[in-house]
Interface confidence: low
């Protein structure tokens, strides 16, 4: 089979079981809101076992030399049925068997010179990004693992010759801010990337990441925190130079306001990332004084 | 149990080639990253290389670079080290890890296997 | 590369008292930092890692701190068979490396 039709059968392959695996969830919690306002119906069968989530792999993105640094292990995943219920066991490990294939026949061949070469390879590359991000958060360990690495060989594979959109695609799932894992392993791929972005794209990438660090910030998972925590020190790296007084304080409220949460977790992530965030404004001295006045509010 | 068995160290010559295994059982192979470490005798340990979960991703030392390749089946559940081109610096112990929930930190290690490189 | 310096090079101590081992980085490697025990004829044991949380199964003892490039190895109370080589390893950046070991001896 020529490789664009393994390609787009996979894809559609892939596309329709996590279609799937959504509309199940909706009528899940459809079910658990209509429960709430009828009488108990008799005990369903017990879901699976959860699965604790391994973190990002230690492996770096880049070939050399900087390895991302590995986020805490976030709390296990939703016991969430990938399949009904009522289906044989086998049904199920084989399906997770032809999710892993469809990610490995997607990664293998996105980076293949006759892809590659392909006049809708653009659109291709944005529907692997995007799959591989949605297997992230898959219920399946294994698929977890192998999303993650396909993300890492096609970014290592194609960031010489497709960069802007490999940037373009993470950025699009950090925006979506959806599943934590998928919103993580964007994140800290993304903020590895960042230092690449060509100059003139800086001021209108930060323009549009703003919203995004400041509507993360306000998510109640301590994985996403940490993962935020040490992206925004990158993020801030490449674009804070960019960034105008009002920009920067608007983001820095954003993280002051987390020094206020009942997680110590959350609270340290803030107040890295907030010193972070003056560490790389245009005026660093000006921001560290602001940002001590605030906080000396805070005590009084 | 989580079970790592290290194999196929000995004497060689310098300029020789050797190929050292890693049999793992008691855990799910594929979904971690495996490494291998060395101890020289009487010194400190050293880090050799590095392989990623489905393989996709290796790294190494500078000091094994171009001379020893790691890989693994995962089907079979073996990591493998072949290391090529010896020199008396690469005597030592090799030890092969497993990563601890894919964080990078080796919290699994096989007792050894000793490589003695000489003429 | 990072360079990772331990010190002392031998620490020697009484039962009940406390060691303070301390690692050194030549550059900042945040908090990705682990220790490791390694007692002769055994292979190295993971005590702590991200620099200050406690692998499955070590006593509270042992406890990491430090962030950037200093780190420390405190073992509260010493214990005979606390007597062996600990090593501290970055995983900040490629390659990897470890220091040279604190020997830590128990009179």
């Known amino acids: 089979m020529a490789t664009l039709e393994k390609l787009m059968k996979a894809f559609e392959s892939l596309k329709s079981f996590q279609q799937q695996q959504q509309q199940q969830q909706q009528q899940q919690q459809q079910q658990q809101q209509q429960q709430q306002q009828q009488p108990p119906p008799p005990p369903p069968p017990p879901p699976p076992p959860q699965l604790p989530q391994p973190p990002p792999q230690a492996q770096p993105l880049l070939p050399q030399p900087q390895p991302p640094p590995p986020p805490p292990p976030p709390p296990p995943g939703p016991a969430v049925a990938e399949e009904p219920l009522h289906r044989p066991k086998k049904e199920l490990s084989a399906t997770k068997k032809d999710r892993v294939n469809h990610c490995l026949t997607i990664c293998e061949n996105i980076v293949a010179q006759s892809v590659r070469n392909s006049p809708e390879f653009q659109k291709l590359l944005g529907i692997a990004m995007e799959l591989f991000l949605l297997c992230s958060d898959d219920a399946e360990s294994d698929v977890r693992m192998v999303a993650d690495e396909c993300l890492n060989k096609v970014i290592k594979a194609l960031m010489d010759s497709n960069l802007p959109r490999l940037q373009l695609e993470l950025y699009k799932e950090i925006k979506k801010n959806g599943a934590p894992r998928s919103l993580r392993a964007a994140l800290w791929r993304f903020a590895e990337l960042a230092h690449l972005v060509r100059p003139q794209k800086c001021r209108p990438y930060l323009v549009n990441l703003l919203p995004c660090l400041t509507r993360t910030s306000k998510r109640p998972e301590e994985s996403v925190q940490e993962t935020l925590a040490a992206a925004v020190p990158k993020i801030m790296a490449s674009f804070g130079n960019f960034a105008n007084d009002n920009e920067i304080k608007v983001l820095l409220k954003a993280f002051i306001a987390n020094l206020k949460s009942s997680s110590p977790t959350i609270r340290r992530t803030a107040a890295g990332s907030a010193v972070s965030i003056c560490q790389h404004s245009r005026r660093t001295q000006y921001f560290y004084s602001w940002l001590l006045n605030v906080l000396l509010g805070l005590l009084v | 149990e989580v079970q790592l068995v290290e194999t196929g160290g000995g004497f060689v010559q310098p300029g020789g080639s050797l190929r050292l295994s890693c049999a793992a059982s008691?855990?799910?192979?594929?979904?971690?990253?495996m490494s291998w470490v060395r101890q020289a005798p009487g010194k400190g340990l050293e880090w050799v290389s590095d392989?990623?979960?489905?393989?996709?991703?290796?790294y190494y030392a500078d000091s094994v670079k171009g001379r020893f390749t790691i890989s693994r089946d995962n089907s079979d559940n073996t990591l493998y080290l072949d290391m090529s081109s010896l020199r008396a610096e690469d005597t030592a112990r090799y030890y092969c890890?497993?990563?601890?929930?894919?964080?990078?930190?080796?919290?699994?290690w096989g007792q050894g296997t000793l490589v003695t490189v000489s003429s | 590369e990072i360079v990772m310096t331990q010190s002392p090079a031998t620490l020697t101590l009484s039962p009940g008292e406390r060691a303070t081992l301390s690692c050194r980085a030549s550059?900042?490697?945040?908090?990705?930092l682990g220790w490791y025990q390694q007692k002769p004829g055994q292979a190295p044991r993971l005590l702590i890692y991200?620099?200050?949380i406690r692998a499955t199964g070590i006593p509270d003892r042992f406890s990491g701190s430090g962030s950037g490039t200093d780190f420390t190895l405190t073992i509260s109370s010493l214990e005979p068979e606390d007597s062996a080589v600990y090593y501290c390893?970055?995983?900040?950046?490629?390659?990897?490396?470890f220091g040279g070991g604190t020997k830590v001896e128990i009179k």
């Open positions: 890890a497993k990563d601890r929930k894919r964080s990078g930190w080796y919290e699994q």
């Open positions: 008691g855990f799910n192979f594929g979904s971690y990253a």
């Open positions: 392989i990623s979960g489905i393989g996709s991703n290796t």
């Open positions: 550059q900042s490697i945040s908090a990705y």
């Open positions: 991200d620099a200050s």
């Open positions: 390893h970055q995983r900040s950046k490629w390659p990897l490396t």
